[in-house]
C-alpha cells in the first residue's frame, strides 16, 4: 500500500509548487522502511557496495561537475544547477570556462580553474580548509572539501558568493540519492538536509540512510553486523 501526501512546497526557483510525497506503507503496520533500515534491517546496500546505487552516485557527480551557480537577477537568491535549468532571462549562470576562471593558486597564475563556480563556496574566500600550499583544491568541484570557515567579510564582490543561497544537498530515499533542494522541500520529502555543505559530492547519503555506526570509508558500505542484528 502507498500513502500519498500532497503539499505546496517552496522549490528551487523560489516559487511554491504542488509536490507529492509517496510513502510505501508497512504491510504489517509498523515502522517505515527508512526506520527499519535505521534500526538495523538486512538492507544489502548498507552491507556491501550496490552497483545500481554506485552508478547513480557517479551519474550525479558527472552532472554536478558541469554545474554552475544560478543567480537570480532580482537578488532573490542563488542555487547550484545545470545551465539548462537556469533561466537565460531571469538569472545569471556563473560558470568558469575558457580562461574566465580564477588561477589555481597565487603561485600558479597561468593555470585557471574550469570547474565551478559553486554557490557560496570559493577557494579564494575559504579560510578553513584554505586552498594553498600543498592543499590546493583540485580543479574538480566534486572533490572540493566542505568549507568550515569563510573569510570574515560581509561582501566578496563575487556574484556566486554574495547571493542568498536557496538550496543545499538533501539526501532523499533509501537509495541514497542526493538533490540540491530547499530546506522545505527536503523536509517534506523526509530527506536529510545538509546545512553545512554546498554540493552533493560533499555528502554521503547512503551513510545517512543506513545509520548505526558510520562507514569506515563513507564511500564503502561495511555494516556486515546487520546480518546478526536482525
Amino acid at each position: 500500500a502507498q500513502h500519498v501526501t500532497t503539499q505546496l512546497v517552496l522549490r528551487n526557483k523560489g516559487v511554491y509548487e504542488s509536490v507529492k510525497y509517496i510513502q510505501q506503507e508497512n504491510f504489517w503496520i509498523g515502522p517505515s522502511s527508512i526506520d527499519l533500515i535505521h534500526l538495523g534491517a538486512k538492507f544489502s546496500p548498507c552491507i556491501r557496495k550496490d552497483q545500481q546505487i554506485e552508478q547513480l552516485v557517479l551519474r550525479e557527480r558527472d552532472l554536478e561537475r558541469d554545474s554552475g551557480c544560478c543567480v537570480q537577477n532580482d537578488h532573490s537568491g542563488c542555487i547550484q544547477t545545470q545551465r539548462k535549468d537556469c533561466s537565460e532571462t531571469l538569472a545569471t549562470f556563473v560558470k568558469w570556462q575558457d580562461d574566465t576562471g580564477p588561477p589555481m593558486d597565487k603561485s600558479d597564475l597561468g593555470q585557471k580553474r574550469t570547474s565551478g563556480a559553486v554557490c557560496h563556496q570559493d577557494p579564494r574566500t575559504c579560510e578553513e580548509p584554505a586552498s594553498s600550499g600543498a592543499h590546493i583544491w583540485p580543479d574538480d568541484i566534486t572533490k572540493w572539501p566542505i568549507c568550515t570557515e569563510q573569510a570574515k567579510s560581509n561582501r566578496t564582490g563575487f556574484l556566486h558568493m554574495d547571493c542568498q543561497i536557496k538550496g543545499r544537498p538533501c539526501c532523499i530515499s533509501t537509495k541514497g540519492s542526493c538533490e540540491i533542494t530547499t530546506r522545505e522541500y527536503c523536509e517534506f520529502m523526509h530527506g536529510y538536509f545538509h546545512e553545512e555543505a554546498t554540493l552533493c559530492s560533499q555528502v554521503h547519503c547512503l551513510d545517512k540512510v543506513c545509520g548505526l555506526l558510520p562507514f569506515l570509508n563513507p564511500e564503502v558500505p561495511d555494516q556486515f553486523y546487520r546480518l546478526w542484528l536482525s
Epitope: 603561485s107 597564475l109 584554505a130 573569510a151 570574515k152 564582490g157
Partner: antibody, heavy 123, light 106 residues
Framework: QVTLRESGPALVKPTQTLTLTCTFS??????????VGWIRQPPGKALEWLAH???????YYNSALKSRLTISKDTSKNQVVLTITNMDPVDTATYYC???????????????WGQGTLVTVSS | AIQLTQSPSSLSASVGDRVTITCRAS?????MYWYQQKPGKAPKVLIY???NLASGVPSRFSGSGSGTDYTLTISSLQPEDFATYYC?????????FGQGTKLEIK
C-alpha cells in the same frame, strides 16, 4: 578608510642598502586574501613591480631583482618592510606600496596605493 | 616575462573626444588591469578583470579585449582625465606594466 604611507631615506649612497617601510591602516595583513606590494617608478619612466607579500607570509619577487630584495611584514604594527641591497644610481625612483585585494576579481589588483617616496641614489 | 606594449605612447585630444588606448601582450593573458596616474600622484585603479569598473570610477571609462589585445576607452573626455594610463597583467610572474600612454590636452 584604507591608507598606506611609505617611509625611508630620501638619499642613499651607491652600494648601500635601502630599507623602506610601508605603514598602513584600514585593513589587516592577517586578513585572509590580503597582500601588500611594492612598485617603483624612475623619474619620467614606467611602473615596475618589485615584490609583494601575502597574509599567509608567501612572498613573490621580481626575478630580475630577486637577489637584492627582501620583503617582510609585521602584522602587529601594520607594516611591510622592503630592503634593497647594493643600491645603484639606476635605482633612483619613487617607491610605492599598494594594497592587493581580489574583491570581485578573478585575479588580484593593486587597489589602494600610498603617495610614494622619492629615493635618490647618489654619492 | 610578459611584455606589455601600449599604443600610442602619447596622444592629444580635446574635451568630449572619444579616446582608445591599446595594450598588446607578448603572450596571451586572461585579464588586463588599467591604472590612471596624474603628475606627482600615485596611480589609481580604473579597470580590473579587463572590463570591470573599479569603485568610484566614472562610467565613461570602459575596458575590453582578450588574449593579447586589450583596450581602454574613454567615451567622452573630461578635463580631469588628462593623465598617464598604464595597463598591467597578473597572469604570470614577474608582474608587468605597460610603458604608459600620456593623454594631453590638444
Amino acid at each position: 578608510q584604507v591608507t598606506l604611507r611609505e617611509s625611508g631615506p630620501a638619499l642613499v649612497k651607491p652600494t648601500q642598502t635601502l630599507t623602506l617601510t610601508c605603514t598602513f591602516s584600514g585593513f589587516s595583513l592577517s586578513t585572509f586574501g590580503m597582500g601588500v606590494g611594492w612598485i617603483r617608478q624612475p623619474p619620467g619612466k614606467a611602473l615596475e613591480w618589485l615584490a609583494h607579500i601575502w597574509w599567509d607570509d608567501e612572498k613573490y619577487y621580481n626575478s630580475a631583482l630577486k637577489s637584492r630584495l627582501t620583503i617582510s611584514k609585521d602584522t602587529s604594527k601594520n607594516q611591510v618592510v622592503l630592503t634593497i641591497t647594493n643600491m645603484d644610481p639606476v635605482d633612483t625612483a619613487t617607491y610605492y606600496c599598494a594594497r592587493i585585494s581580489n574583491y570581485g576579481s578573478n585575479y588580484w589588483y593593486f587597489n589602494v596605493w600610498g603617495q610614494g617616496t622619492l629615493v635618490t641614489v647618489s654619492s | 616575462a610578459i611584455q606589455l606594449t601600449q599604443s600610442p605612447s602619447s596622444l592629444s585630444a580635446s574635451v568630449g573626444d572619444r579616446v582608445t588606448i591599446t595594450c598588446r601582450a607578448s603572450s596571451s593573458v586572461s585579464y588586463m588591469y588599467w591604472y590612471q596616474q596624474k603628475p606627482g600622484k600615485a596611480p589609481k585603479v580604473l579597470i580590473y578583470d579587463t572590463s570591470n569598473l573599479a569603485s568610484g570610477v566614472p562610467s565613461r571609462f570602459s575596458g575590453s579585449g582578450s588574449g593579447t589585445d586589450y583596450t581602454l576607452t574613454i567615451s567622452s573626455l573630461q578635463p580631469e582625465d588628462f593623465a598617464t594610463y598604464y595597463c598591467q597583467q597578473w597572469n604570470a610572474y614577474p608582474l608587468t606594466f605597460g610603458q604608459g600612454t600620456k593623454l594631453e590636452i590638444k
